[in-house]
Interface confidence: low
Amino acid sequence: QDSPPQILVHPQDQLFQGPGPARMSCQASGQPPPTIRWLLNGQPLSMVPPDPHHLLPDGTLLLLQPPARGHAHDGQALSTDLGVYTCEASNRLGTAVSRGARLSVAVLREDFQIQPRDMVAVVGEQFTLECGPPWGHPEPTVSWWKDGKPLALQPGRHTVSGGSLLMARAEKSDEGTYMCVATNSAGHRESRAARVSIQEPQDYTEPVELLAVRIQLENVTLLNPDPAEGPKPRPAVWLSWKVSGPAAPAQSYTALFRTQTAPGGQGAPWAEELLAGWQSAELGGLHWGQDYEFKVRPSSGRARGPDSNVLLLRLPEKVPSAPPQEVTLKPGNGTVFVSWVPPPAENHNGIIRGYQVWSLGNTSLPPANWTVVGEQTQLEIATHMPGSYCVQVAAVTGAGAGEPSRPVCLLLEQAMERATQEPSEHGPWTLEQLRATLKR
């Protein structure tokens, strides 16, 4: 008896680790037996070379290799998300749609967010070696090595928090070279080696007056960028504070600042910067589009006074200061696929909320633009005739669209049987190459 399709085996989320193909399973019942088709991010897969997807007779989808979406080794942001796959089973009585399964790729970037630094600690006192592991998917775990061997963590003496190593009481035997190692299924990364020297405590008397100092951080003002710093300066702020208590016991003041985490989240470690001032000073090297917490700490020699109150400052977002990278145009079945990689993280200048894609005039596409919202880094454009297709892509933050990529073009021949990419080893054409060919 005839029956509509029903999904029996749904595809499952998985991590693409290679080198072999990734498999997505889908099994369905129904009479007549249903035909299976797969969709990626809601778009049907063509299964026609050079599409890396291949459909097996039992409905299983093979992904022979992940699309070229950037390289973990080039230090650029990499989209780990290859997309959400769904399968559809259809016969003349209807269609059944599976649950979506996300395929993502294991990535571990090279660049540590914070590298451990050489430091001098005092016997009996605590010290911290900072380490911000590189961004990775899945999130990397952090281990510490000392003098080339894994560090045996002693409860109560060693604590690893957010990657940083906290030593409760320094001992002479803690002297040595430390390295932070980040590991996930994509591999591992080693930080720079940091030299830790341990000194015996010196006889000194801590100025008691310093403990009586109260600092009130009164203002944190965003400074107007200095034109001499070029067109894309990092933001700087002006801190001003008031000191009350004993007469000028502090020899210096240090700014402590960090990006504000979401409420309830564990606070980021405080960065420290010696300030060139006794009541106010400039602090630079911040990032646009971030919320910062600031406080000031007085010190005199090795003695430190109590921290000031905390002030918050929301640095406005700016447009991204670099274009999306690795923009590619590929022919599809009656469509052109545009894909790209986000700009480098240091050029985001806020949260990238999406991308703007322009087609350029004087080609087969009339001048038009599309908005891609969210983290998606690809776009499918319908094409109705052979000819040249040229696009530019720009990343968008809350402040607007940033610098566009340089135009990338693709020449589609009659009936879109094949795409002319001349010279083939150079991939998609630039606008200049295309114009030269059309003149010929």
């Epitope: 009164e218 203002n219 944190v220 003002t221 965003l222 702020v237 409420p263 309830g264 989240g265 606070g267 919320d291 917490e293 109150n309 905390v310 002030l311 918050l312 400052l313 929301r314 640095l315 406005p316």
Partner: antibody, heavy 124, light 107 residues
């Protein structure tokens, strides 16, 4: 001397509209976050929303989102609270208040100057 | 939104008493807490900001402490003018929230 003065309160029917003003003196509102806070009769304080005139930044409590709009006229050094589709539960004394600090961004965990408040009564 | 729970909701005390009011946040708010005093028919007045910093012009008998989720306002020696309602407020999130208030009455 720093001062905030609210005005524009009164009796309005449910579904009606009202615009409150918060006139500032002794400082320019452009560099500060100005918040609106309300207090229903015999009840506690409830945050309504804020504006940061220099950046045009605004945000609202969920209870008023879509009905209330905060704006500012920096030439008049005044912030406004436009209240539409008023309900009986919006009946309260409305205060405007200034966040401590003079900087780009909300800051410093405290509202140091408050207006005297203006009473809004929503009743048929 | 982050909830701020104050206790007690009211208390009776005498002049010279030491009074402690507590405030608990529903999640970590760092030191983003302020305390206000409000008298009937008047606007709130800022006493403490950043959890422990005395606002200028506020008598030193008022003090604040705490970080994370638990905060305390202490009046070391209650004066006649201190009988009022006290509110805590967090500004760790974009949507500030207030405690429900603690009324300090004369015993």
């Amino acid at each position: 001397e720093v001062q905030l003065v609210e005005s524009g309160g009164g009796l309005v029917q449910p579904g009606g509209s009202l615009r409150l003003s918060c006139a500032a003196s002794g400082f320019t509102i452009n560099g500060y976050y100005i918040h609106w806070v309300r207090q229903a009769p015999g009840k506690g304080l409830e945050w309504v929303g804020f504006i940061y005139p220099a950046g045009g930044d605004t945000d609202y409590a969920d209870s008023v989102k879509g009905r209330f709009t905060i704006s500012a006229d920096t030439s008049k050094n005044t912030a406004y609270l436009q209240m539409n589709s008023l309900r009986a539960e919006d009946t309260a004394v409305y205060y405007c208040a200034r966040l401590i600090g003079n900087k780009f961004g909300w800051s410093s965990y405290g509202m140091d100057y408050w207006g005297q408040g203006t009473l809004v009564t929503v009743s048929s | 939104d982050i909830q701020m729970t104050q206790s007690p909701s009211s208390l009776s005390a005498s002049v010279g008493d030491r009074v402690t009011i507590t405030c608990r946040a529903s999640q970590d708010v760092s030191t983003a807490v302020a305390w206000y005093q409000q008298k009937p028919g008047k606007a709130p007045k800022l006493l403490i900001y950043s959890a422990s910093f005395l606002y200028s012009g506020v008598p030193s008998r008022f003090s604040g402490s705490g970080s994370g989720t638990d905060f305390t306002l202490t009046i070391s020696s209650l004066q006649p003018e201190d009988f009022a309602t006290y509110y805590c407020q967090q500004s760790r999130s974009d949507h500030p929230t207030f405690g429900q208030g603690t009324k300090v009455e004369i015993k």
